[in-house]
């Protein structure tokens, strides 16, 4: 039977001769050279050679356990003479014995990691891992220990796990953001003679909100014209914050000051500047300087850093309102004046007043916008604003005159303003009453005395305060011996009555009655109107049958009388 089952061979042999592995030997071997040893399997004939007479095996090349730790071969012993096996073919193993020929290798050449600034000592940063190709089951060739070569006193590494932790209190990103740490992994449990490898760990401190915003100056001053519309930006202020990103975001607010309701402050979402804007219309003449207290604060606070102080800062903002030359301002938005229609030319109606609102109080001159008074009925004293007539008025032609008055700064004609002026013309009794229509009526030949043949109405262009009161009468020259009478109804109407029984159209076919109409105002105005009465033949019902032709064709004012 075979006298072996496995061989051990040290890796990485450096001798000049072939490396001796071991000897195959059968107890059938008498040492007379009758047996022949044959090797087959992993590396036989190439890597491993055998002396066929003695059974000695040698390795022809340097072996690397990390490349192949075990070789499986087969051994045969045959009788040279017969060629028959003297032993059954058998498998055997050559085990490559480890030496510490591999240094630990990190899984990455360079690691990158982040850790918040101001982290507590011992805060986990990253874990590095190194592997050693040597045999972990034999000796300490693959037992790796980690140590820090560069990066102290800021960081430490756990020797067995490769976990990197912070080692220094209050590491401040604003002071230093980047750290390069070099970690060594050494085998042999870190003992002398062990092999080592290194890696670089680039550690970045991430920002936390440990810095408040700070104004670089305590006072800012801006100017803005009083004409700035609401929303206008008038200046920018910037608080600096050593933090970055969200931790450097700043909210600005007006916390105090006389202009709290006149100004606003917003944050530029890109630059983090505070923009002072106008909130309400300003007036240089009312207030020329505003002093505001503006606060800059971080909206994202980390409570654990509140002990460092309030995360806000204040500055004073002084805003100077610049005067803008403004147009004159009238004392009223509109003026209503009255004047009697019988006013003489150059009669003063009233006055307007405008004043330059600017501090300079520039003098103002007045004028009438002639587009609104084409007939030049009115004029204005350019110095004092008195309005007077330049033509005679007639209420009955135009009751209201709507004109525009212009006030212009004498020193700066570009600055002008306008005001509507409504002039009401007051009534004067300067029109006589008149018949409301042309009156032409008829009377039947057989009419009886005191018969109403026509009702008269009057109109008057005037508009007396107490209403119209007309009186009617026959003209004096017609009053005596008239065939008709006028009856004043005292309600601004009058009736024409027959004065006799019967009329003869052949004797007198037409009567012309002069009627005097008077009003009751001051001064009394009267006019005379003529009523034409035609005598007609009528049936027994009083319906007209025949008349003079001209009496029948008149289109209006025809009345059948009684």
């Amino acid at each position: 039977s075979w006298m072996w089952n496995q061989f051990f061979l040290l890796e990485e042999y450096t001798g000049s001769d072939y490396q001796y592995v071991g000897k195959l030997h059968s107890d059938q071997d008498r040492g007379d050279g009758s047996l022949k040893y044959i090797l087959s399997g992993d590396g036989a004939g190439d890597l491993f050679i055998i002396n066929e007479n003695t059974g000695d095996i040698q390795a022809t090349k340097r072996l690397d356990r990390e490349e192949k730790p075990v070789y499986i071969l087969r051994a045969q012993a045959i009788n040279r003479r017969t060629g028959r096996p003297v032993e059954p073919e058998s498998e055997f193993i050559i085990k490559i014995h480890d030496i510490n020929d591999n240094e630990p290798i990190f899984t990455k050449d360079v690691y990158t990691a982040t850790v918040p600034e101001m982290a507590d000592v011992g805060t986990f940063v990253v874990q590095v891992t190194a592997t050693d190709a040597d045999d972990p089951t034999y000796g300490n060739s693959a037992k790796v220990v980690y140590s820090i070569l560069q990066g102290q006193p800021y960081f430490s590494v756990e020797s067995e796990t490769g976990i990197i932790k912070t080692a220094l209190l209050n590491m401040d990103r604003e002071n230093r953001e980047q750290y390069q740490v070099v970690i060594q992994a050494k085998d042999m449990g870190g003992q002398m003679g062990g092999l080592s490898g290194t890696t670089t760990v680039n550690i970045t401190l991430t920002d936390v909100n440990d810095n408040p915003p700070r104004f670089p100056q305590s006072t800012y001053q801006f100017k803005t014209p009083e004409s700035s519309p609401p929303g206008t930006p008038i200046g920018r202020i910037k608080a600096s914050d050593a933090d970055v990103g969200e931790n450097a975001e700043i909210e600005y607010s007006i916390t105090d000051g006389e202009g709290h309701d006149m100004f606003d402050v917003i944050t530029d979402q890109e630059t983090q500047e505070g923009i002072i804007t106008v909130k309400k219309l300003l007036d240089f003449e009312k207030k020329r300087v505003y002093t505001l207290k503006v606060e800059a604060s971080n909206p994202h606070i980390e409570p654990r850093f509140l002990y460092l102080g309030p995360f806000k800062d204040s500055a004073t903002v002084r805003i100077v309102v610049d005067d803008v030359d403004e147009p004159p301002v009238f004392s009223k938005p509109a003026y209503i004046l009255q004047i009697r229609e019988d006013a003489q030319i150059n009669t003063t109606i009233g006055s307007v007043a405008a004043q330059d609102p600017d501090a300079a109080r520039n003098p103002v001159k007045y004028s009438v916008d002639r587009h609104t008074d084409m007939d030049r009925i009115f004029n204005i004293d350019s110095g004092n604003g008195s309005i007077f007539t330049s033509k005679l008025l007639d209420r009955e032609t135009l009751l209201w005159h709507n004109i525009t008055v212009i006030a212009t700064e004498i020193n700066n004609p570009k600055q002008s303003s306008r005001v509507p002026l409504y002039i009401k013309v007051l009534d004067v009794n300067d029109n006589a009453p008149e018949f409301a229509e042309f009156y032409e009526t008829f009377v039947c030949e057989k009419a009886k005395a005191d018969q109403l043949i026509q009702t008269l109405h009057a109109v008057d262009k005037d508009d007396p305060y107490s209403g119209h009161q007309f009186s009617f009468s026959l003209a004096p020259e017609a009053a005596s011996g008239s065939n008709f009478t006028i009856q004043d109804n005292k309600d601004n109407t009058a009736g024409i009555l027959t004065r006799k029984n019967g009329y003869n159209r052949h004797e007198m076919s037409t009567y012309l009655l002069p009627v005097v109409i008077s009003d009751n105002d001051y001064p009394v105005q009267s006019s005379t109107g003529t009523v034409t009465v035609r005598v007609c033949a009528c049936d027994h019902h009083g319906n007209m049958q025949s008349c003079h032709a001209e009496a029948l064709i008149h289109p209006t004012g025809l009345s059948t009388g009684a």
Epitope: P233, I266, T267, D268, Q269, E270, T271, I275
Partner: antibody, heavy 121, light 107 residues
């Protein structure tokens, strides 16, 4: 006077790509975030993308409908804004406007004339 | 994401009318972040009111804005012929969002 002039629109097949450009003038380009807004024919306005300023690391933001397909970028040295549009779909057909915010980077104060992108086979 | 809902979606009015458009946010936002725009057919939108109540340059004083929290309003005190357009509200928190628009038409 603020001016924004878009270019690069045109007809493209579904799945295709297009790059829009916007030339800005009349203001300090580097202090404003910039946006692309689009309007499909007969429809309302839809924000597409925004890019912040250098101080904010040129951070970009996108509407869900274009994320992973569109890329907004800017070249401050050329006062230019870009929109790279890939994997275009028919629903991307719209007039694309380049838009600058108001002072303080609020609102959308200044709009270009728009460039029409038609995605059709 | 903050949703903005405008009402009404469309409205007919006459010259001289007083018109109010509302914009409701799905969650509370600072008044600094809410803006209104006017858009006419074939034109780019135009900023009308910024930060809830400030009139943009060149905008007539008949336009006004108000509101806070979740409810905001655009008012036109006396409609003029040139005011017939589509109006949008918009908020600034990323992702930026717009209301669906209100089309103002001549009655």
């Amino acid at each position: 006077e603020v001016q924004l002039v878009e270019s690069g629109g045109g007809l493209v097949q579904p799945g295709g790509s297009l790059r829009l450009s916007c030339a800005a003038s009349g203001f300090t380009f580097t202090t404003y975030a910039m946006n692309w807004v689009r309007q499909a024919p007969g429809k309302g306005l839809e924000w597409v993308a925004r890019i912040r300023i250098k101080n904010n690391n040129y951070a970009t933001y996108y509407a869900d409908s274009v994320t992973d397909r569109f890329t907004i970028s800017r070249d401050d040295s050329k006062n230019s804004l870009y929109l790279q549009m890939n994997s275009l779909k028919t629903e991307d057909t719209a007039v694309y406007y380049c838009v600058r915010p108001d002072y303080g980077n609020y609102g959308l104060a200044y709009w270009g004339q728009g460039t029409l992108v038609t995605v059709s086979s | 994401d903050i949703q903005l809902t405008q009402s009404p979606s469309s409205l007919s009015a006459s010259v001289g009318d007083r018109v109010t458009i509302t914009c409701s946010a799905s969650s509370s936002i600072s008044s600094h972040y809410l803006h209104w725009y006017q858009q006419k057919p074939g034109k780019s939108p135009k900023l009308l009111i910024y930060r809830s109540f400030y009139l943009a340059s060149g905008v007539p004083s008949r336009f006004s804005g108000s509101g806070s929290g979740t409810d905001f309003t655009l008012t036109i005190s006396s409609l003029q012929p040139e005011d017939f357009a589509t109006y949008y509200c918009q908020q600034d928190i990323v992702p930026l969002t717009f209301g669906q628009g209100t089309k103002l038409e001549i009655k």
